[in-house]
């Protein structure tokens, strides 16, 4: 399928068929206009002028967004000003503010906890399979296989630290070389960026919010994919990461450090360990071909154990496996040897929910997956709602200005680098890039942070997670210290190299452009977001994995034509946009291809046909939940509970009624008034800070 699917259909010049297209103003209230006053509540009555168009049909069919959809929404204030409040109102407002802050922190806490539980759930569902990926002997010779294994394992266990620690233990026990481990680390870097992309999916209800959130999340994906695209071949050719890190490691005078500080985990662990506790050694053991581990459960049952060393008679497959020739014998049936066995005596059981259920790992995993996704989704919705009610007026302006404004000239270029440091610092504090980028996603969605600012923060997050790994490596035991430090440094320098590639020169900030492109497509066709997730994180890696197992000839035989087609399409696309005259008439657009190969419209129709039956019940459920939510939060009566329903919005669009879905921070009364339904917001529930 050709990239940028809808561009082929776009009109080259809107001004030819739409009068005054260039001068049409966005619909915004004029602050200077008079306002009617009812019950001390200001309801702005807006007078605006829609310029005439020659064909409303054309407007609906080919919507022209004069506003840049990537401009941050104006976070408007619909409450009573602080100066106009009486003492009681001011006290009420302060308490309301404190309450909101507590709620925000509470939901943020459960949001982070649910991410932790989500990771555990993924490990229970796919951890053992992920461990088996590592036991594939072809990793040594095939860096591409190593890369996709890194992606798949990290996606399955939802934790790059788990996959990295498996790699470290494999390198430490000589099952893997550092050279073979580097592509896996690169893959782990890609895999970890799925978490915030999943979080972005939770904001699918509002198109413009989803556009920003999804682009903000996928900027991380694109950065990682592009970095690998360039740096993996460079590493295979030059082994620069291996060489540089080896030099650094060899210059170190080793002394085991203190344990890496657990900062955020100190707060979240007491809660998450009541839900489930995992024995993460099992995945590592499976990766290291330990047959006994395959039957072990990942769910930790005993938390307090006493380990005793004892000599035991154990059976071995042959005499060659004996600990020493003098300690080998037979009982007439089996061959025996004497081994030092660590005998583990169970003392105290763990205190989590699943400790006495004895359910299979898959069952526990699925239960936790559903619960954690529901909690994650719920927390996210509530965080967005609370932020939406808090970030208004001057507060919003201050925050937006602080975060998104550059330093004064000539230091403007430094702002991004400061953002990288902030991202690294914050990630170091929360000890997880997933947590940091996932917390960033809703903020991008609601328009507090621009994608341009989110990008360096995300890059910083990538650096932050590697500094945590370096600290953890320095605290690791002697036998794994060298390998874990070298791998952590490889991870660090890989991210540094990526930043040097895709950040310093504004022109090279491709991930932003690609993420915005994907955001635009996903906002129009929301199913495409899931499609993207499946293709990039599952389908492509699994295909490469399968082809790699089939051997180099098959991988090259399939890969070369695919890569050739992609390059051809990209070159054509570049020529079409930059210098179409060079191309023959037929190749100046994608119309020579069947519609399904250059537009998502036909695919949308097919998918809508399949998803149609599920939309109504889903929509009703969404409305009910939203109403309950509104009652709990004390939202105004005009709360848009139908915004998550496509049928209302798209049904009207189909009938030729242009619908402007209100933005999260639009002044609701204006939107209502435009539809002839003016309602005064409840003054009790609206509170403007400052």
């Amino acid at each position: 399928m050709a990239p940028w699917p809808e561009l082929g259909d776009a009109q080259p010049n809107p001004s030819k068929y739409l009068e005054g297209a260039t001068s049409q103003q966005p619909i915004t209230p004029d602050k200077s206009k008079e306002t009617n006053k009812t019950d001390n509540t200001e309801v702005p009555v807006t007078k605006f002028e829609l310029l005439p168009t020659y064909s409303t049909a054309t407007l609906i069919e080919e919507p022209t967004e004069v506003d840049d959809p990537w401009n941050l929404p104006t976070l408007q204030d619909s409450g009573i000003k602080w100066s106009e409040r009486d003492a009681k109102g001011k006290i009420l407002c302060v308490f309301q503010g404190i309450g909101r802050l507590i709620l925000l922190l509470g939901f943020l806490y459960f949001f982070v906890c649910s991410l932790d539980v989500l990771s555990s759930a993924f490990q229970l569902v796919g951890g053992k399979m992920a461990g088996q990926f590592f036991s594939n002997s072809s990793i040594m010779s095939n860096p591409l296989l190593g890369l996709v294994i890194g992606v798949l394992v990290t996606v399955f266990v939802q934790s790059s630290s788990t996959s990295t620690s498996i790699v470290v233990s494999m390198v430490a026990s000589s099952l893997l070389t550092v050279r073979a481990a580097i592509p896996i680390i690169m893959g782990a870097n890609i895999g970890t960026s799925i978490t915030n992309t999943i979080v972005a999916l939770m904001q699918v209800g509002d198109r413009s919010e989803f556009r920003r959130a999804f682009a903000g999340a996928t900027v991380h994906d694109f950065f990682n994919w592009l970095s690998v695209l360039v740096l993996l071949p460079v590493e295979v050719a030059t082994h620069y990461l291996e060489v540089v890190t080896q030099l650094i490691v060899e210059s170190f005078h080793f002394k085991n450090g203190e344990d890496a500080p657990d900062l955020l985990k100190v707060i979240t662990k007491p809660f998450t360990k009541l839900i489930v506790q995992l024995d993460k050694k099992v995945i590592s053991q499976i990766a290291m071909n330990d047959e006994t581990a395959k039957n072990k459960s990942l769910v930790k049952i005993w938390c307090k154990t006493f380990t005793n060393m004892t000599q035991m008679n154990v059976t071995v497959p042959s005499m060659a496996n004996c600990t020493s020739p003098s300690l080998c014998w037979t009982d007439g049936i089996q061959i025996w040897t004497m081994k030092n066995v660590t005998y583990k005596e169970n003392i105290a059981k763990c205190q989590h929910i699943f400790v006495n259920f004895h359910l299979p790992d898959l069952a526990v995993g699925i239960i936790l997956l559903i619960i954690s996704l529901l909690v994650l989704c719920g927390c996210l919705i509530m965080i967005v709602k609370i932020l939406g009610s808090v970030l208004k007026g001057q507060v919003a302006t201050v925050i937006k200005k602080t975060i998104n404004t550059d330093f004064p000239f000539p230091f403007a270029w430094l702002t991004g680098y400061l953002a990288i440091l902030v991202g690294a610092g914050m990630t170091f504090i929360v000890q997880s890039s997933s947590v940091f980028t996932s917390a960033l996603t809703p903020l991008i969605g609601i328009g507090v942070i621009t994608i341009e600012r989110a990008y360096p923060l995300t890059l910083g997050s990538n650096i932050g997670t590697t500094t945590t790994a370096i600290l953890a490596a320095l605290a690791s035991p002697g036998n794994t210290l060298r390998s874990s430090l070298q791998i952590a440094l490889c991870h660090f320098f890989f991210n540094i190299s990526g930043i040097l590639l895709w950040y310093p020169i504004p022109f090279t900030r491709l991930p932003i452009r690609m993420a915005k492109g994907l955001g635009n497509i996903s906002a129009k066709y929301r199913w495409f977001a899931i499609f993207y997730l499946i293709i990039f994180f599952f389908l492509i890696p699994l295909t490469v994995f399968g082809l790699s197992l089939a051997g180099w000839p098959v991988l090259v035989g399939v890969g070369v034509p695919v890569v050739f087609i992609i390059i051809l399409v990209l070159c054509l696309r570049l020529l079409q946009s930059r210098c179409p005259r060079v191309l023959p008439k037929k190749l100046q657009n994608w119309n020579f291809l069947p519609l399904c190969m250059h537009s998502l419209k036909p695919w949308d129709a097919v998918i809508s046909k399949f998803t149609g039956p599920f939309q109504m019940p889903c929509c009703c459920c969404c409305r009910v939940c939203c109403r309950v939510c509104c009652l709990l939060c004390g939202c105004p009566k005009c709360c848009r509970c139908s915004k998550c329903c496509q049928d209302l919005e798209e049904g009207q669009e189909a009938q030729g009624v242009p619908v402007k879905a209100p933005e999260t921070f639009d002044n609701i009364t204006i939107s209502r008034e435009a539809q002839g339904e003016v309602r005064a917001p409840d003054s009790k529930t609206e509170c403007t800070a400052l």
Epitope: T315, M319, C328, W329, D331, G332, I333, Q334
Partner: antibody, heavy 119, light 107 residues
Framework: QVQLQQPGAELVKPGASVKMSCKAS????????MQWVKQTYGQGLEWIGA????????SYNQNFKVKATLTADKISSTAYMQLSSLTSEDSAVYYC????????????WGQGTLVTVSA | DIVMTQSHKFMSTSVGDRVSITCKAS??????VVWYQQKPGQFPKLLIY???TRHAGVPDRFTGSGSGTDFTLTISNVQSEDLADYFC?????????FGSGTKLEIK
């Protein structure tokens, strides 16, 4: 106390088969391997093979692989050895002996069954 | 197969004497050697296992020694009831093999 009971003697014709028993008592039959040993005046002691009554797993001396078949009945706590295509060379005393798992020695022996192959 | 060789078919001794019965393995068997005593008309009885460990109830005049390929069963202060055949056996590998036996005679 541990006891291994074997029939005292068996008289068989050449070419025929014999199935001798070894009834165990005084211990958990499935927890110990049952070994079979042949003793002739010319050859001394020869190990025939072993059976693990719990799993039914067997192991044979290559010299007896065709000649002997070891079985065990968990219900009656009895081990059996069948000798086929008997010749005069098979005339000997056959002992069953008990060995614990991971022990290659026999602390308990049956009284032995004297097999006489004669026309 | 590992061959266990007992070089002396017969050994003659007097009551109260000390006698050493030897057994040689065709290859290294570590300590995986057992000694049995068989009196006429009886089944073999376990004396020593792991080359030097006395079985329960065996008098301490019986001692085993050796490792690798050379093993010895020593009977100090021989008694008349010690008149019997003595067999060594290796349990290092399958098949388990026995020595041809040494007959102890009392003068």
């Amino acid at each position: 106390q541990v006891q291994l009971q074997q029939p005292g003697a068996e008289l068989v014709k050449p070419g025929a088969s014999v199935k001798m028993s070894c009834k165990a008592s005084g211990y958990t039959f499935t927890s110990y391997n049952m070994q079979w040993v042949k003793q002739t005046y010319g050859q001394g002691l020869e190990w025939i093979g072993a059976i693990s009554p719990g799993s039914g797993e067997t192991s044979y001396n290559q010299n007896f692989k065709v000649k002997a078949t070891l079985t065990a009945d968990k219900i009656s706590s009895t081990a059996y050895m069948q000798l086929s295509s008997l010749t005069s060379e098979d005339s000997a005393v056959y002992y069953c002996a008990r060995a614990a798992r991971a022990e290659g020695w026999f602390a308990y022996w049956g009284q032995g069954t004297l097999v006489t192959v004669s026309a | 197969d590992i061959v266990m060789t007992q070089s002396h078919k017969f050994m003659s001794t007097s009551v109260g004497d000390r006698v050493s019965i030897t057994c040689k393995a065709s290859q290294d068997v570590g300590h995986a050697v057992v000694w049995y005593q068989q009196k006429p008309g009886q089944f073999p009885k376990l004396l020593i296992y792991w080359a030097s460990t006395r079985h329960a109830g065996v008098p301490d005049r019986f001692t085993g020694s050796g490792s690798g390929t050379d093993f010895t069963l020593t009977i100090s202060n021989v008694q008349s009831e010690d008149l019997a055949d003595y067999f060594c056996q290796q349990f290092r590998s399958i098949p388990l093999t026995f020595g041809s036996g040494t007959k102890l005679e009392i003068k």
